[in-house]
Amino acid sequence: EVEKTACPSGKKAREIDESLIFYKKWELEACVDAALLATQMDRVNAIPFTYEQLDVLKHKLDELYPQGYPESVIQHLGYLFLKMSPEDIRKWNVTSLETLKALLEVNKGHEMSPQVATLIDRFVKGRGQLDKDTLDTLTAFYPGYLCSLSPEELSSVPPSSIWAVRPQDLDTCDPRQLDVLYPKARLAFQNMNGSEYFVKIQSFLGGAPTEDLKALSQQNVSMDLATFMKLRTDAVLPLTVAEVQKLLGPHVEGLKAEERHRPVRDWILRQRQDDLDTLGLGLQGGIPNGYLVLDLSMQEALS
């Protein structure tokens, strides 16, 4: 806590400017009016302050706005935002996308800090849903943002926002998240033609069911192995050898290199060996010729 001392003669700040640059802590406390600081926050970032000095300025704002800073101040915090704690930010009501962008810019190039996570949470909750402009902004600054959300949070993403999603934004998503995002993407891209549709839907296919994969196999899409390896195992297992061959097109040769990995390994175990042999890839582990396959899961479903 900074002691309350009188401001020395001639040192009272009339403006927030570089004349404050070498003020001691107690001089800043005594000579800088909090209301003046609040109206001229944008100037602070043009002055090289020490952390100690910034702590004094933050303390002044905290005293002026004990219930949380108004958006007019928040928008101009600049690098002082990095001095805020998540507890400070929880008091804010940020509604403007411009304010959000200004603060994300400050943290640009860094991993998402607890402060940024709290800011985003406050902003999204205030808006009620992740609209396209917000998602656009967040994924531009944090490509992994979408995959940091729970399936429940993702359910509030409107299909229209999916247009803002880039393939790299989904790199760290798990199957549960893709299960939520895939139907939204399918809806968002439904009016596109075959090849364009596949380009857009490709990164979401980790959430696709078997029937959609079967439908894609009829469209000469030539899915690459990287995409195939990210498909849900339970969605791949019912596909026939012919369907997988059509789905992968020229990339089918890549199955050999992946035969020990899921979902390829599990899929091979479900195919007849003589069907696998038709691929000419030397895939081993299929059901030997002459064996009868009982689908117990289907039997249970019928009973």
């Epitope: 570089e18 970032n45 000095q53 002082l80």
Partner: antibody
Framework: EVQLLESGGGLVQPGGSLRLSCAAS????????MSWVRQAPGKGLEWVSA????????YYADSVKGRFTISRDNSKNTLYLQMNSLRAEDTAVYYC?????????????WGRGTLVTVSS | IQLTQSPSSLSASVGDRVTITCRAS??????LAWYQQKPGKAPKLLIY???SLESGVPSRFSGSGSGTDFTLTISSLQPEDFATYYC?????????FGGGTKVEIK
């Protein structure tokens, strides 16, 4: 090209004076606080003095206070260090350094340095 | 505020992971920068705000720490990394530098 170029160093006797200059180019000189940092032979770095962008505010390390004066001429894009009452312990390479421009006091651009030797 | 760097010198080979520490005499939050200096050359900024990589600096350099203990790590030492490294605090005046750590070829 963004650069800083120091000059004015040399051999001077104890008690003597010297004026160092630092010519800046490639950036808006008047927008940036500037500093002088020195390095005695075989030793580490020591922050000597700093000045605000307009030249209105200055700061000195205790070791040079009252003997050194920092100033700048923004019309000439030049930083100065007037050194009086020089002592043997002031022998060092003197660097001018530019404030990083991101609120915090670190230096993102340095000159090559000029050597000041104080000896009789 | 005094900054103590350790070790004062170290020998390492190309490809090695190198760690340099900087300890502050009192807490300085994340108000720390790291510089590299080669013989006869000016210092060059590597890291500011304890962990922020300066533009154009290779990603093999990284900084961490907060409070009193800070670390500069070079994940895989390259021939051009043999130099002296300094930390600097900007928590309060006067700004101070560590004594330096010289990284030499083994």
């Amino acid at each position: 090209e963004v650069q800083l170029l120091e000059s004015g160093g040399g051999l001077v006797q104890p008690g003597g004076s010297l004026r160092l200059s630092c010519a800046a180019s490639g950036f808006t000189f008047s927008s940036y606080a500037m500093s002088w940092v020195r390095q005695a032979p075989g030793k580490g770095l020591e922050w000597v003095s700093a000045i605000s962008g307009s030249g209105g505010s200055t700061y000195y390390a205790d070791s040079v206070k009252g003997r050194f004066t920092i100033s700048r001429d923004n019309s000439k894009n030049t930083l100065y260090l007037q050194m009086n009452s020089l002592r043997a312990e002031d022998t060092a390479v003197y660097y001018c350094a530019k404030w990083g421009g991101r609120l915090y006091w670190y230096f993102d651009l340095w000159g090559r340095g000029t050597l000041v030797t104080v000896s009789s | 505020i005094q900054l103590t760097q350790s070790p004062s010198s170290l020998s390492a080979s190309v490809g090695d992971r190198v760690t340099i520490t900087c300890r502050a005499s009192q807490g300085i939050s994340s108000a720390l920068a790291w510089y590299q200096q080669k013989p006869g050359k000016a210092p060059k900024l590597l890291i500011y705000d304890a962990s922020s990589l300066e533009s154009g600096v290779p990603s093999r350099f990284s900084g961490s720490g907060s409070g009193t203990d800070f670390t500069l790590t070079i994940s895989s030492l390259q021939p051009e990394d043999f130099a002296t490294y300094y930390c600097q605090q900007f928590n309060n005046y006067p700004l101070t530098f560590g004594g330096g750590t010289k990284v030499e070829i083994k």
